[in-house]
Amino acid sequence: NEGSEREENVEKEGLCNACAWRQNTRYSRIEAIKIQILSKLRLETAPNISKDAIRQLLPRAPPLRELIDQYDVQRDDSSDGSLEDDDYHATTETIITMPTESDFLMQADGKPKCCFFKFSSKIQYNKVVKAQLWIYLRPVKTPTTVFVQILRLIKPMKDGTRYTGIRSLKLDMSPGTGIWQSIDVKTVLQNWLKQPESNLGIEIKALDENGHDLAVTFPGPGEDGLNPFLEVKVTDTPKRSRRDFGLDCDEHSTESRCCRYPLTVDFEAFGWDWIIAPKRYKANYCSGECEFVFLQKYPHTHLVHQANPRGSAGPCCTPTKMSPINMLYFNGKEQIIYGKIPAMVVDRCGCS
Amino acid sequence: NEGSEREENVEKEGLCNACAWRQNTRYSRIEAIKIQILSKLRLETAPNISKDAIRQLLPRAPPLRELIDQYDVQRDDSSDGSLEDDDYHATTETIITMPTESDFLMQADGKPKCCFFKFSSKIQYNKVVKAQLWIYLRPVKTPTTVFVQILRLIKPMKDGTRYTGIRSLKLDMSPGTGIWQSIDVKTVLQNWLKQPESNLGIEIKALDENGHDLAVTFPGPGEDGLNPFLEVKVTDTPKRSRRDFGLDCDEHSTESRCCRYPLTVDFEAFGWDWIIAPKRYKANYCSGECEFVFLQKYPHTHLVHQANPRGSAGPCCTPTKMSPINMLYFNGKEQIIYGKIPAMVVDRCGCS
């Protein structure tokens, strides 16, 4: 009985030490944040500006309203605990897709016609920023005007219509080399992604004044690499499960391992009225112990540690992902600045 | 003599250990990078694609050329050793500037006239993306057409001309509330920044059909916050000296402290033809010992360590800044992807 009591006391003392340590860490982090903000804004001291002066100087105008309104909805890290931005996987920026064969696009002689594009799921779930169809026009012998048409195949209508227009343009071509021409197909691509069954393919025409088609749709001899293709630019903000990430704890947690703890910095609390917005923000901090292969920032860190003859100190609990905050503030010269301050929020803690 | 020989041997052994450790670290880092690339690209294995297939599939087209050309000039970290992007200080995005008084802008009775804008060096050295002059037009009682004129003061010319037009516009105002109107003044602002002596101020007129000026240039009672102001959007990529950063070493270095070491990853060397570009890149790695307050990532880390009752392990040598690489590759589905792979280059090492 005595033994278990002693054990309990030791445990309490351990928790108490952890609490005191976290308390110290919190205090240090707040002081450091104050120093950091002034230093990052290149201010020697906090601008001396009263609430009245702010009321007087602050334009009651749309651009200011917009900036301040961003802060009305406080960014809450835990709004969706299961998913967050994936800063590990590659972000796709451009996808170049070649045409493939399709049953819909057949000529009378059974040969495939150009062009059908299949889309990977990579495009499906991304916001298309730009989509260009690139076509190569064969060289001409004399100056000529070329009419380019990009047609979209549709299911034949009652009246027999099989096409609808995507884009058309007029080009003046001079003798010499062939040219690559790009055509904006963003809208049609977005429709295809929304309704994949509507993607039956496209037809490309580039007729000169005499009706000759200059577009390379199926490369002839010496025309390798001159196929039409789609260049799609996407913004890719993939999400991944928070399971892959560091631990999140709260102040009452008994977790001894490396963990992220909440910490809200309140500018009003320390009289920084010169910061117009936000009035407070979630900064967070890291605290806890690291074992060798626990929560390492880079997947290979444990390999390095395994091979580490001088690595006795081991990894340490540190922010592995930080994000900026946007701030609207007076700089003491009757100017209002809206800017981004890097690395002010701890998003994740890990051992590295 | 024997003592100094023993000492020399110990030192050699220490260096040898350090070499072996670094060799291990290098090897681990390369293996880890290979695993990372496949994992970050969500590929289970390296795509099996021959050089011939690549030659055939690769469009000989401008967008591909552009992407590949980026890699012809290999990014060399040491191209400018003294300056690099500043990821510490705040980046300014929007500056809102209020009018100040000026000697040039005086009315006959000696009262100041609106408007003179002083510009901080923050704008001087940044590229202006957008500059809007915002003016508030007092409410009208009946529907009216308003002619807005923004004039720029110039040094009086021989013929007495003191103004030149910046912008004029016609507005239809309905009874009710006053309105904020923005006017594009980017060109004139850029000129002022190039030749500050030409900035003598502006005059604002907003005359209704009866010749009444509706523009608030000096706020009357209840018109606080309705002053004209300039909203300037800038792109801000400040540089700071590399002195603030971590140490850089080479393979022959005897440095024992936390340091960044060079490491080039050569994709061709391990037969990864599916990566179109780059063929090789500088990955770098971190190695070395950490004292308590040496090279810490965040200015306040030492505060935290000072207060750390369980911090005996101390900080460790880890990447404190990593950057992505852009990669052009085949994904094995006849698609060429251009994307960004996060955290593949160690830019800086520090103790955190």
Partner: antibody, heavy 128, light 107 residues
Framework: QVQLQESGPGLVKPSQTLSLTCTVS??????????WSWIRQPPGKGLEWIGY???????DYNPSLKSRVTMSVDTSKNQFSLKVNSVTAADTAVYYC????????????????????WGQGTTVTVSS | EIVMTQSPATLSLSPGERATLSCRAS??????LAWYQQKPGQAPRLLIY???NRATGIPARFSGSGSGTDFTLTISSLEPEDFAVYYC?????????FGGGTKVEIK
């Protein structure tokens, strides 16, 4: 409501130059996104496109007439004109000026090669 | 150049009947086809462009269809004012060409 009116001599001698003017009323030629065409119709026959001119002075001519045709725009007079050199009896026709259709949207630019407002036409006879 | 062939040359119908006019291109012109109506002593009037788009003010009884080389203009129920000559025009190439016309006359 935009209206077009052709004017010029009704009779031109062979080998001379045929000059026609089209006056635009009911709208300013310089503030519209349109291009302006000339079409002709020989007696009892179908229509033949001659060419068009836009505000920038850029022209497109029927290749069969290209060597003999010149078109221009005079925004100050709200007019555009046609000149055909070295005329022969084969150039006898009713000449129409027309406004190109303003394209539905930026997507299908080639629609501007159709004509949605026409003048009532002027007869030109080439004879000595 | 692209040759446009219209058929029939003459179509004799009564008011209220359905008229179907055909236009064939010597090669594919995609959807770059327009239809015009011309009455004696008058200038042509644009009816349809882009195969099936009605020009401003054109009644719904006029409709166009087709793509590639074969195109049709349909007048669902002939009104007295519809008796005229109808021309198709291709603009698939920069050398714009018209068909020879189809005359729709009262039977």
């Amino acid at each position: 409501q935009v209206q077009l009116q052709e004017s010029g001599p009704g009779l031109v001698k062979p080998s001379q130059t045929l000059s026609l003017t089209c006056t635009v009323s009911g709208g300013s030629i310089s503030s519209s996104p349109y291009s302006w065409s000339w079409i002709r119709q020989p007696p009892g026959k179908g229509l033949e496109w001659i060419g068009y001119v836009d505000l920038a002075g850029s022209t497109d001519y029927n290749p069969s007439l290209k060597s003999r045709v010149t078109m221009s725009v005079d925004t100050s007079k709200n007019q555009f004109s046609l000149k055909v050199n070295s005329v022969t009896a084969a150039d006898t026709a009713v000449y129409y000026c027309a406004r190109a259709l303003s394209s539905r949207s930026s997507e299908w630019l080639l629609d501007q090669y159709t004509m949605d407002v026409w003048g009532q036409g002027t007869t030109v006879t080439v004879s000595s | 150049e692209i040759v446009m062939t219209q058929s029939p040359a003459t179509l004799s119908l009564s008011p209220g009947e359905r008229a179907t006019l055909s236009c064939r291109a010597s090669q594919s012109i995609g959807i770059n086809l327009a239809w015009y109506q011309q009455k004696p002593g008058q200038a042509p009037r644009l009816l349809i462009y882009g195969v099936s788009n009605r020009a401003t003010g054109i009644p719904a009884r006029f409709s166009g269809s087709g793509s590639g080389t074969d195109f049709t203009l349909t007048i669902s129920s002939l009104e007295p004012e519809d008796f005229a000559v109808y021309y198709c025009q291709q603009y698939g190439t920069a050398r714009l060409t018209f068909g020879g016309g189809t005359k729709v006359e009262i039977k």
